[in-house]
Amino acid sequence: HNTTVFQGVAGQSLQVSCPYDSMKHWGRRKAWCRQLGEKGPCQRVVSTHNLWLLSFLRRWNGSTAITDDTLGGTLTITLRNLQPHDAGLYQCQSLHGSEADTLRKVLVEVLADPLDHRDAGDLWFPGESESFEDAHVEH
């Protein structure tokens, strides 16, 4: 999986979208989890409604919300009132039984200021940035 970077500004909201094949993942609940280390587990932050048919209903855990457009095939996560400690590597997951498929790896960056964006022009709108190839050097 490539990693998609989403950048937001501290104190503001950030919306993360994870597109997927709606037929392939039909009937599956989704989840948003945080990778806590190179080899550590992905710690569940929030998951969609227990009843798949109600996945469109927004579910909150603290300042993080999740909602799933199961027909369109888009999982949306909202991080409200972004703080620096919200930055990190996350995953959108599709759940089946005790297994989880990674839909997208997401790197959330929280900037102190919109102008901190490294390619900032006169105006910069928070959101999705380019994808980066995974390039992990083994030691």
Partner: antibody, heavy 119, light 107 residues
Framework: QLQESGPVLVKPGASVKMSCKAS????????MNWVKQSHGKSLEWIGV????????SYNQKFKGKATLTVDKSSSTAYMELNSLTSEDSAVYYC??????????????WGQGTLVTVSA | DIQMTQSPSSLSASLGERVSLTCRAS??????LSWLQQKPDGTIKRLIY???TLDSGVPKRFSGSRSGSDYSLTISSLESEDFADYYC?????????FGGGTKLEIK
């Protein structure tokens, strides 16, 4: 794990670029912070860089004074300070953050680089 | 910016004594606080993060706690290598800020 460059003596108005070479971990996986300590004083956070993307966030106080960069190929973080004055004479530390974040603070610190600004 | 008010600024204590240092946050930091130790040679080491989690390799005589906006570092029984400068750091929001420091000296 974090090896900083040696002490420097620079003239007022000049610039200085110091380095922080990382080893023993995947450089791009961990944020790098820079911190200033003036003689006999407390610590001040200058800013942070994500080595994976190059994205930076600065303390407003150091915007325009400090520039943070990385060289992924050599696992080295850099901080450049410009238009130096006596107020910039201090020890500067690099401090590693946590996995793609600073959500557990700064676990590892460099030994510090002493910058002296004097005519 | 969040102000971290650290007290006392200096403290003289004897070997084996129990001491406590405090940092008060001017705004809510939700436990995003760590304690750092700086030795006379300038070396900085993190002792505690998330207000109360002890770093691996740090002696059990160090502990961290929280009461509202007050955060404390306690050393249960001072040893010679504990005489150093101590700082708190809040990493809840930008810009990250440090306490003014506590110089712990031998009485």
């Amino acid at each position: 794990q974090l090896q900083e460059s040696g002490p420097v003596l620079v003239k007022p108005g000049a610039s200085v670029k110091m380095s922080c070479k990382a080893s023993g971990y995947t450089f791009t996986d961990y944020y790098m912070n820079w911190v200033k300590q003036s003689h006999g004083k407390s610590l001040e956070w200058i800013g942070v860089i994500n080595p994976y993307t190059g994205a930076t966030s600065y303390n407003q106080k150091f915007k325009g004074k400090a520039t943070l960069t990385v060289d992924k190929s050599s696992s080295t973080a850099y901080m450049e300070l410009n238009s130096l004055t006596s107020e910039d004479s201090a020890v500067y530390y690099c401090a590693r953050g946590t996995y793609y974040s600073n959500y557990e603070g700064f676990p590892y610190w460099g030994q510090g680089t002493l910058v002296t600004v004097s005519a | 910016d969040i102000q971290m008010t650290q007290s006392p600024s200096s403290l003289s204590a004897s070997l084996g004594e129990r001491v406590s240092l405090t940092c008060r946050a001017s705004q809510e930091i939700s436990g995003y606080l760590s304690w750092l130790q700086q030795k006379p040679d300038g070396t900085i080491k993190r002792l505690i993060y998330a207000a109360s989690t002890l770093d691996s390799g740090v002696p059990k005589r160090f502990s961290g706690s929280r009461s509202g906006s007050d955060y404390s570092l306690t050393i249960s029984s001072l040893e010679s290598e504990d005489f150093a400068d101590y700082y708190c750091l809040q990493y809840a929001s930008y810009p990250y800020t440090f306490g003014g420091g506590t110089k712990l000296e031998i009485k």
